[in-house]
Amino acid sequence: DGCNDIFMKNEMLSASQPFAFNCTFPPITSGEVSVTWYKNSSKIPVSKIIQSRIHQDETWILFLPMEWGDSGVYQCVIKGRDSCHRIHVNLTVFEKQWCDTSVKGLPNLSDEYKQILHLGKDDSLTCHLHFPKSCILGPIKWYKDCNEITGERFTVLETRLLVSNVSAEDRGNYACQVILTHSGKQYEVLNGITVSITERAGYGGSVPKIIYPKNNSIEVQLGTTLIVDCNITDTKDNTNLRCWRVNNTLVDDYYNESKRIREGVETHASFREYNLYTVNITFLEVKMEDYGLPFMCHAGVSAAYIMLQLPAPDFR
């Protein structure tokens, strides 16, 4: 049929909860292409009707929710003007009671569900949530051994659980829970994560480098909206936290009520020797109280600030 078979991706999935898989294969999907999903070599494409339990949503295949009978090989066909590529995705659905202590972990879970914390360090766990824009995700709750996590050492930040001064007792079974809303219906997403610990330095002794800011000032008019990127390079194996703080407090916590200043979602680009991370800070409206205050970007042991200042008056 003239299509290139690219690779087989294996995914282990939990029954009775939503799942989505995005058919992306750069640089193939970056141009003008059409994407069509099929199940088990069927000639009939997966439905695009959003009311269908299984349907295609742009380049995604979306299961609302996943069921036992959904196990199998799915193909996404990427057609360009002069090309055709087919990606095979092997989905295996399992029944897992995250609070069933008789089941000692799952051997073939994807790496997203196996995470490592570094003893004695400040570290984090990530709740991996891959869904199309049509899915609205609520706030994330975190559990350890089926109890909701509380305590001063734990902070929820976006999709991460920050753990300060990691101890041996922090190892074990975690879960992150979020309510997903799609077309007015609500679904629970519960991702189990097996968390192990290590004393090994996660970044081989090197420290992250903050490219920007550089402890510099920015001229900005009162009342304007401002977005500032913090750009960081770090080793691929790093476990460093990256965040914005003011007065030694996470900006999202400091401005918790007004939400006037917020931290953005972290993104990263992967290079051969390192990763380049970007996490921004957004000032919805710059106020007088913001001037002269150091807004600190932190990355592991590294930190750098920006300071807002009023533009010099123009006497022309």
């Epitope: 790496d111 003893l119 610990i197 290590t198 004393e199």
Partner: antibody, heavy 120, light 106 residues
Amino acid sequence: QVQLQESGPGLVKPSQTLSLTCTVSGASITSGYWNWIRNHPGKGLEYIGYISYSGYTYYNPSLKSRVTISRDTSKNQFSLKLSSVTAADTAVYYCATGGYDYVEDALYYWGQGTLVTVSS
Amino acid sequence: DIQMTQSPSSLSASVGDRVTITCRASSNVRYMYWYQQKPGKAPKLWIYLTSNLASGVPSRFSGSGSGTSYTLTISSLQPEDFATYYCQQYTTSPYTFGQGTKLEIK
């Protein structure tokens, strides 16, 4: 059950490169830490280095200039290369991994070991 | 580098004896790991995180210590305990082993 198996030549000539491969079953090398350790005859254990879940490598500084650890995720294997060998590199070489009771540093799973003799 | 010094280097003891092996680190370490090795065999994880016994390790073994001084104790030596024991630390690179303590039958 996690199993590790070392393979490679048992005899290497001085100044040449020692090459060993560890084949892993029952676990993915894209999770955890994958270690090389050696045991000199009549002497103790020496930690050589590891390759991590992300491909990051760590080498014992005493061997760093001569050692390379790499992996082939498609075959679920990781390898050790030690260049410019001398008789002092004659040892039993082990691959090992941890993760026991959620502790990555607790090396619970070991290969059976392979004796490498450096001799002309 | 953190130097790990085990004492004694070798020890002759009888079945039923209480035996203590000490591992001293040249700097503070957070946790200690102990391995048992018998001739011609791969080492076995014996004690992890200073005091936790690995699966299958008899309860006559115990581990303790903090800072720079750690011990492995056998309350009543049995014939199958005769082996070489190694301590190891991961707190500071390089991740060093002790030189080993060879436990022999008297």
